[in-house]
């Protein structure tokens, strides 16, 4: 989508590149903060964020965290760096190209999160990795 | 509220050259990275060129050499330099900073 392959001037400290070794551009990401959500028992949601932001800074990922408590339902979406802790978390799964959500124990609320590195990704938040299948005897034993 | 007014697009011949800007209001472009992203006529939004707030910058392979990108802090403004333009060159052209502001793109049609 945004250019496999980038070059950079040499006059920068901090050198980003992707898995080819080429410079990386800097990831575009739905950045809508917080919002309250409709997301509930769901395989997968749309996170309904209409901003798409580039990041502050080449090494930010898109980021994409689920809470329900006995009031509401949140999606917070999100730029962050993957080698600072999020919510106290490490983002485990910053390389993935999809937002495959995760729990995490937190009190007193549900709590997923996922991370991603390829552009508006968070914009298609999966809560099942089989979700994306093309097997419809597998979805058949999902759902039952 | 903050605005990115863009100018400078328009038809030129095989070879020739444009100088697209980027002027914002209601936000410090010195502070922000500023990126160019163009979208070709049937192809999906790609990255084009990229400015970070200390002046480093990053290019497309494809316009590498071609296109320069730069900054005027005094006038709250990021230029877009594309020389040697070719026809897939071709497409609008926008310019973004976060979080989240677009320009209202700007056409550029190569011949």
């Known amino acids: 989508t945004i250019p496999p392959h980038v070059q950079k001037s040499v006059n920068n400290d901090m050198i980003v590149t992707d898995n080819n070794g080429a410079v990386k551009f800097p990831q575009l990401c739905k950045f809508c903060d917080v919002r309250f959500s409709t997301c509930d028992n769901q395989k997968s949601c749309m996170s309904n964020c209409s901003i798409t932001s580039i990041c502050e800074k080449p090494q930010e990922v898109c980021v994409a965290v689920w809470r329900k408590n006995d009031e509401n339902i949140t999606l917070e979406t999100v730029c962050h760096d993957p080698k600072l802790p999020y919510h106290d978390f490490i983002l485990e799964d910053a390389a993935s190209p999809k937002c495959i959500m995760k729990e995490k124990k937190k009190p007193g609320e549900t709590f997923f999160m996922c991370s991603c590195s390829s552009d508006e990704c968070n914009d298609n938040i999966i809560f099942s990795e089989e979700y994306n299948t093309s097997n419809p005897d597998l979805l058949l034993v999902i759902f039952q | 509220q903050v605005q990115l007014q863009q100018s400078g697009g328009g038809l030129v011949q095989a070879g020739g050259s444009l100088r697209l800007s980027c002027a914002a209001s209601g936000i410090t472009f010195s502070t922000k990275p500023v990126a160019w992203y163009r979208q070709p006529p049937g192809k999906q939004r790609e990255g084009v060129a990229h400015?970070?707030?200390?002046?480093?910058?990053i290019y497309a392979d494809s316009v590498k050499g071609r296109f320069t990108v730069s900054r005027d802090n005094a006038k709250n403004t990021v230029y877009l330099e594309m020389n040697s333009l070719k026809p897939e060159d071709t497409g609008v052209y926008y310019c973004?900073?976060?979080?989240?502001?677009w320009g209202q793109g700007t056409q550029v049609t190569v011949s």
């Open positions: 973004t900073a976060p979080v989240g502001y």
């Open positions: 400015i970070s707030s200390d002046g480093t910058t």
